[in-house]
């Protein structure tokens, strides 16, 4: 366009500004030794200062550590930004009972209502179950469903919440790592190679490129590259791919240039804690009691219900192994979620009844 | 295995410059920040800064913002420090380190050290 | 910048007791704390970071604790390899910053 030529000339004239051919403006070029904070900087507020991956530039333009998210009752809520820490919250299933800068010390398991009340308000990350007497006339065992909910986020059955966390963990700080590796890894959706640059289950700025370096001048191709075993997010981020290296794991789909790698739990499993793009637990297909049968759905976004076969059908399920190893299932990823409305619970021959949940997806 | 090559000791005279390199080998050079850090004899441990070897970016400690100059050769892997103006104070064993990952896991691999000696 | 403190610049021990090194930050790290072991003419040593998480091939007799301003590293039965300087790190804000050290010597 013609009337961008003069603007042009003038932006190579001034030797603090340089032409963007890509938004066809003139834009401030940072100092040596700072970044901008958006593709064509205006001034000099718009640059800053560069830390490593997994660190965040505070207030006081200190390179701080993000908060890690790798102890297994942990997840990541938001990711380490350049400008913010990573933020963790319990998993699902539990709650914060002591909280820590961006983190929390202590998650507990969410209280299972007992006999004789219902849930009032389901357990989030932050709060445990509330529970209320059940209406006049409702007995323990639930005359209608309307008026005998499972708590949302159940598990195995707690009398009180019960701790999982280190009890080294302290209020103001963030927590210790804990936990076995498989946890961890489970906790943290990502594992990483012992030698790895990746941060376990969370994007990481790319350690060459600016997020926000804007496109070299005169080049034609301004897609930002990103390392081997990490892929362009929606956000410009290079983000690691999932890794499918957990021996329950199956890679389902391959780590591309613009979208993760996706695992899915190894024939003979089913997923039972979804992960983005994996898989956090996957235990073996169940075996259906007598008088239960699946119901297949659509792998593990979907929950899973159980329902009594037709009258004259054998249940459509395999016995046994003599080994104890579950039967190979032929949707490897089906989700082992119950409809936490129903008030069911898995016929997993256990000594306690497991509900699972799927609303901490 | 990841391995962190330094030059060899350096004697100096006050007012005068050194130059030393650290070769890194076993995992991509530009994928890591490479810090350097100094020892005085019988003393403790400074972090004098690091330098991203993929774009060139560094970050110094204040203390040191006037005395070391960072650089990298992506071609040769290999990332330099210049200490300029030498004194006595700068008589120390200088290591070129890398972290283990970075998931916060710190410093994990260390160069043999570079021995500056100043002395009239 | 984050102050680095070890109150003990030397620890007399002897080998099977059990050690317990200190070190306190200036300011709140978020247990982003790290302790390196270095023997006379050779590099530092990564044993501990995040206050309590054990580097790769280190024994684990050595433990690390602690949390906020306050950080402990424990040698539960000491070896006569284990006679070193030990010195602690924040990792947690730049510029990153070193305790002054303590040597574990032979009683």
């Known amino acids: 366009f013609p009337q961008d030529r003069p603007f042009e000339d003038t932006c190579h004239g001034n030797p603090s500004h340089y032409y963007d051919k890509a938004v066809r403006r003139c834009c401030y070029r940072c100092p040596m030794g700072l970044f901008p904070t958006q593709q064509c900087p205006q001034r000099p507020t718009d640059c800053r200062k560069q830390c490593e991956p997994d660190y965040y530039l505070d207030e006081a333009d200190r390179c701080t550590a993000c908060v890690t998210c790798s102890r297994d009752d942990l997840v990541e809520k938001t990711p380490c930004a350049w400008n913010s820490s990573r933020v963790c919250e319990c998993r699902p299933g539990m709650f914060c009972s002591t909280s820590a800068v961006n983190s929390c010390a202590r998650c507990f398991f969410h209280s299972v209502c007992p006999a004789g009340m219902i849930v009032k308000f389901p357990g989030t990350a932050q709060k445990n179950t509330v529970c209320e007497p059940a209406s006049p006339g409702v007995s323990p065992a639930c005359a209608s469903p309307e008026n005998c909910k499972e708590p949302s986020s159940g598990t195995i059955p707690q009398a009180k919440p019960t701790p999982v966390s280190p009890a080294t963990s302290s209020a103001s700080t963030m927590p210790v790592r804990g936990g076995t590796r498989l946890a961890q890894e489970a906790a943290s959706k990502l594992t990483r190679a012992p030698d790895s640059p990746s941060s376990v289950g969370r994007p990481s700025s790319d350690p060459g490129l600016s997020p926000t370096q804007p496109c070299p001048e005169g080049s034609g191709d301004c897609r930002k590259q990103c390392e081997p075993d990490y892929y362009l997010d929606e956000a410009g981020r290079c983000t690691a791919c999932v890794s499918c290296s957990r021996d329950d794991l199956v890679e389902k789909t391959p780590c591309a240039w613009n979208s993760s790698r996706t695992c899915e739990c190894r024939p003979g499993m089913i997923c039972a804690t979804s992960a983005t793009n994996s898989c956090a637990r996957c235990v073996p297909y169940p075996i259906c009691a007598a008088e239960t049968v699946t119901k297949p759905q659509d792998m593990a976004e979907k929950d899973t219900t159980f329902e009594a076969p037709p009258l004259g059908t054998q249940p459509d399920c395999n016995p046994t192994p003599e080994n104890g190893e579950a039967p190979a299932s032929t949707s490897p990823t089906q989700s082992l979620l119950v409809d936490s409305q129903a008030s069911k619970t898995l016929p997993i021959p256990t000594s306690a009844p497991v509900a699972l949940s799927s609303t901490g997806k | 295995q990841v391995q962190l090559q330094q030059s060899g000791a350096e004697l100096a005279k006050p007012g005068a410059s050194v130059k030393m390199s650290c070769k890194a080998s076993g995992y991509t050079f530009t994928t890591y920040w490479m810090h350097w850090v100094k020892q005085r004899p019988g003393q403790g441990l400074e972090w004098i800064g690091y330098?991203?070897?993929?774009?060139?970016?560094?970050d110094y400690n204040e203390k040191f913002k006037d005395k070391a100059t960072l650089t990298a050769d992506k071609s040769s892997s290999t990332a330099y420090m210049q200490l300029s103006s030498l004194t006595s104070e700068d008589s120390a064993v200088y290591y070129c380190?890398?972290?283990?990952?970075?998931?916060?896991?710190?410093?994990?691999?260390w160069g043999q050290g570079t021995l500056v000696s100043v002395s009239a | 910048d984050i102050v680095m403190t070890q109150s003990h610049k030397f620890m007399s021990t002897s080998v099977g007791d059990r050690v317990t090194i200190t070190c306190k930050a200036s300011q709140d790290v978020s247990t982003a704390v790290a302790w390196y072991q270095q023997k006379p003419g050779h590099s530092p040593k990564l044993l501990i970071y995040?206050?309590?998480t054990r580097h790769t091939g280190v024994p684990d007799r050595f433990t690390g604790s602690g949390s906020g301003t306050d950080y402990t590293l424990t040698i539960s039965s000491v070896q006569v390899e284990d006679l070193a300087l030990y010195y602690c790190q924040q990792h947690y804000s730049t510029p990153f910053t070193f305790g002054s050290g303590t040597k574990l010597e032979i009683k």
């Open positions: 330098i991203n070897p993929s774009t060139g970016y560094t």
């Open positions: 380190v890398r972290r283990g990952s970075y998931d916060g896991n710190p410093f994990a691999y």
């Open positions: 995040w206050a309590s």
